[in-house]
């Protein structure tokens, strides 16, 4: 697992413990909470990041309301079960044996049940809509400049292949970033759109996951882009299975 050899740290994940005890004395970094070795040359999976976040006391956070068109992370933080590759296990359960099924970004996609609940497969989230509202500025940003800057950000900071940034929409003050990545499109080594979206979400909140880097300084032609509200919608390859009671609530 690559990491900065000089001081043995993980550039892409500060929620790790790194030590020069890897093969041949190389730097090896393990995610807090799970202890899984992580590849520091790319983003760490959202599941391992959530597990690391839950390994120490945290402040509760305010959540957005669920959308009727897509899944929104309305259940808040939980301590997830990750598979050996660091992905979310399809079925998640809490300490009181309440279980539910999640999608590939760890968002609940069924009603809650008991230990008998079956989640046959991990359903892929193939479309993520990041909805931002920026703080008032002297004038609207130039759409093509904004588009180019956000695409550059996802390519350079999050190492997401440009083909997965499907569109950037802008109607002042709302910015929408569409990420699309089908199972068939994702090749080995490609950053997952769910992981990129999570890193972006944490960056926007001033909680950068990168080691030793400054916080996110988003500028469009020198003008700061300051986000005051973020909503993230998740669309799965297979529609979620909620009871009518929830759907009509």
């Amino acid at each position: 697992h690559t990491a900065a050899q000089d001081n043995c740290t993980c550039p892409t994940n500060k929620m790790t413990v790194c030590s020069p005890d890897g093969p041949g004395g190389r730097c090896q970094c393990r995610a807090l909470g799970s202890g899984m070795a992580v590849d520091c040359s790319t983003l760490t999976s959202k599941c391992l990041l959530l597990k690391a976040r839950m390994s120490a006391p945290k402040n509760a956070r305010t959540l957005v309301r669920p959308s009727e068109h897509a899944l929104v992370d309305n259940d808040g933080l939980y301590d997830p079960d990750c598979d050996p590759e660091g992905r979310f296990k399809a079925r998640q359960c809490n300490q009181t044996s309440v279980c539910w099924c999640v999608n590939s970004v760890g968002v609940r996609r069924t009603d809650k049940g008991d230990l008998s609940l079956r989640c046959d497969e991990l359903v892929r989230t193939h479309h993520i809509l990041i909805d931002l509202r920026h703080r008032p500025t002297a004038g609207a940003f130039n759409h093509s400049d904004l588009d180019a800057e956000l695409r550059r950000l996802f390519r350079e900071r999050y190492r997401l292949h440009p083909k997965f940034v499907a569109a950037v929409h802008y109607e002042q003050p709302t910015i929408q970033i569409e990420l699309r990545q089908n199972t068939s499109q994702k090749a080995a080594g490609d950053v997952d759109i769910g992981d990129a979206a999570y890193y972006f979400e944490r960056d926007i909140k001033g909680e950068s996951l990168f080691q030793g880097r400054g916080g996110l300084d988003l500028r469009v032609r020198g003008e700061p882009l300051q986000v005051e509200r973020t909503l993230i919608y998740y669309l799965d390859e297979i529609p979620p299975k909620f009871s009518m009671k929830r759907l009509t609530a």
Epitope: V17, S19, P20, D21, P23, L32, S34, A37, P84
Partner: antibody, heavy 117, light 107 residues
Framework: EVQLVQSGAEVKKPGASVKVSCKAS????????INWVRQAPGQGLEWMGN????????NYNQKFKDRVTMTRDTSTSTVYMELSSLRSEDTAVYYC??????????WGQGTLVTVSS | EIVLTQSPATLSLSPGERATLSCRAS??????ISWYQQKPGQAPRLLIE???ESISGIPARFSGSGSGTDFTLTISSLEPEDFAVYYC?????????FGGGTKVEIK
């Protein structure tokens, strides 16, 4: 030569605490995890937790989480494992082990802790 | 937590025979497995790391294989000093866990 030297045998009463030490030498103390593993008489090996001496980050097996504390003293290259609220089933040999390349490469000689009223 | 199941619990063999010890993980752990030998009154001794990589100073008759969930420790020709208890251990994730052990005894 890498060496891990542990403190001597202890006899404790139920409810008491025990603190076992593990002094490391022959390598850069702060660079490698120290793990604690115990073995009850006639039983297998059980991992209790570990500590990274460089920053004192600890990780405990859930089974012992409320009773175990691991600390380190970099000035003496020593790691300590304290187990509280002892019960008879804690009678075991306690080993410290230095962790490298995904394996427990070096082991202390073991410390027998006997819990008896 | 990842559960490691070793089989058989006891292996009765004669010196010179081949010993095959098995370790099965409850989930895919790649090659994050190590093997240890323990004799009575002694601390365990590392034999194999990363499922198949030998440790310097360990006789060549000890070899490891496998990946994912099924792992094997093979002793090609048992020497008298090889009769002991053998443990597998995973370091894929915390908590690190050990198998229950296989005792190799003289037949």
């Amino acid at each position: 030569e890498v060496q891990l030297v542990q403190s001597g045998a202890e006899v404790k009463k139920p409810g008491a605490s025990v603190k076992v030490s593990c002094k490391a030498s022959g390598y850069t103390f702060t660079s490698y995890w120290i793990n604690w593993v115990r073995q009850a008489p006639g039983q297998g090996l059980e991992w209790m937790g570990n500590i990274y001496p460089s920053n004192s980050y600890t990780n405990y097996n859930q089974k012992f989480k409320d009773r175990v504390t691991m600390t380190r003293d970099t000035s003496t290259s020593t790691v300590y494992m304290e187990l509280s609220s002892l019960r008879s089933e804690d009678t075991a040999v306690y080993y410290c082990s230095s962790y490298r390349s995904d394996a427990f490469a070096y082991w202390g000689q073991g410390t027998l802790v006997t819990v008896s009223s | 937590e990842i559960v490691l199941t070793q089989s058989p619990a006891t292996l009765s063999l004669s010196p010179g025979e081949r010993a095959t010890l098995s370790c099965r993980a409850s989930q895919n752990i790649g090659t994050s497995i190590s093997w240890y030998q323990q004799k009575p009154g002694q601390a365990p001794r590392l034999l194999i790391e990363f499922a198949s990589e030998s440790i310097s100073g360990i006789p060549a008759r000890f070899s490891g294989s496998g990946s994912g969930t099924d792992f094997t420790l093979t002793i090609s020709s048992l020497e008298p000093e090889d009769f002991a208890v053998y443990y597998c251990q995973q370091s894929n994730s915390w908590p690190f866990t050990f198998g229950g052990g296989t005792k190799v005894e003289i037949k």
